[in-house]
């Protein structure tokens, strides 16, 4: 039975040209995390694998930094980055947990952050 839950940074907004940290946290399970995937809609952004470390997809290499923690930092944001992002935790023996974050990239300088982790 899957007992875990994923907390995410929820709906967040950021300014065009700026950067944002996407964070998820898996809690309430003793399952071992073997890999965390970060995806944007159907595109793979990055993987953090227990044995192999971080892999950033070539098309995002210049704009995506691994971390902090199991999170992901998106840099040089464009309006096209607006959309859904998913953290997918692969665990043993539970299976897969998925968290969703919606990012809105704003043109103006009045972007305000929604609910966020205190860990940036």
């Amino acid at each position: 039975m899957m007992t875990g839950t994923i907390e995410t940074t929820g709906n967040i907004s950021a300014e065009k040209g700026g950067s944002i940290i996407l964070q998820c946290h898996l809690s309430s399970t003793t399952a071992q995390v073997t890999q965390v995937n970060w995806e944007q809609q159907d595109q793979l952004l990055a993987i953090c694998n227990a044995d192999l470390g971080w892999h950033i997809s070539p098309s995002f290499k210049d704009r995506v930094a691994p971390g902090p923690g199991l999170g992901l930092t998106l840099q040089s944001l464009t309006v096209n980055d607006t959309g859904e992002y998913f953290c997918i935790y692969h665990t043993y023996p539970d299976g897969t947990y998925t968290g969703r974050i919606f990012l809105e990239v704003l043109e103006s300088s009045v972007a305000e952050h929604g609910a966020r982790f205190q860990i940036p």
Epitope: H25, S27, T34, A50, L52, G53, W54, G69, I119
Partner: antibody, heavy 117, light 107 residues
């Protein structure tokens, strides 16, 4: 298996600089953050900063900005830490370490830096 | 910066005794906490990562618990080889910070 081999002890003069190294083997160097930790005799552990060789990203403890510079040479799988304007306060053992949230941390054997006139 | 308050700073315990060391973060760090053992003139050794996960090769008498702000390292039955200094480390955001250490000695 993962190994981090650090350079040997250094005896350096106050006001000068020193560059110590950490050669990684047994894993893909560009895929993991590599950090540096300071330990003065009789003191605890202090995090200096870390570097992600795959993109050159760095994080520094504010206290060590301007003191430590972290670099990495991916061709030789070696990370470096340069310490500048050395004083007696910089005399310490410096450890390199490799970690992820998913596997824990591997440590180098430490490099003793002694600053003395 | 997040401050890690570790206690006790030193302690004596008897062989076979259950020993608990605690670390308190100044704010929520989720599960981004590791525990290390260090012996004199040696590199630290990872015991626990991600708050509760036992590192490879570490005896099962060591365990970690907690999340958020309060964490603990427990040795279920103390052995002579456990004489060392123990440190916690939070690694969820830069700068990472260590606890002050706990020096554990045998009575």
């Amino acid at each position: 298996q993962v190994q981090l081999q650090q350079s040997g002890a250094e005896l350096v003069r106050p006001g000068t600089s020193v560059k110590i190294s950490c050669k990684a083997s047994g894993y893909t160097f560009t895929n993991f953050w590599l950090g540096w930790v300071k330990q003065r005799p009789g003191h605890g552990l202090e995090w200096v900063g870390d570097i992600f060789p795959g993109g050159g990203y760095t994080n520094y403890n504010e206290k060590f900005k301007g003191k430590a510079t972290l670099t990495a040479d991916t061709s030789s799988s070696t990370a470096y830490m340069q310490l500048s304007s050395l004083t007696s306060e910089d005399s310490a053992v410096y450890f390199c370490s490799r970690s992820t949230m998913l596997t824990g941390t591997y440590w180098g054997q430490g490099t003793l830096v002694t600053v003395s006139a | 910066d997040i401050k890690m308050t570790q206690s006790p700073s030193s302690m004596y315990a008897s062989l076979g005794e259950r020993v608990t060391i605690t670390c308190k973060a100044s704010r929520d760090i989720k599960s981004y906490l590791s525990w290390y053992q260090q012996k004199p003139w040696k590199s630290p050794k990872t015991l626990i990562f991600y708050a509760t996960r036992l590192a490879d090769g570490v005896p099962s008498r060591f365990s970690g618990s907690g999340s958020g702000q309060d964490f603990s390292l427990t040795i279920s039955s103390l052995e002579s080889d456990d004489t060392a200094t123990y440190y916690c480390l939070h690694h969820g955001e830069s700068p990472y910070t260590f606890g002050g250490g706990t020096k554990l000695e045998i009575k």
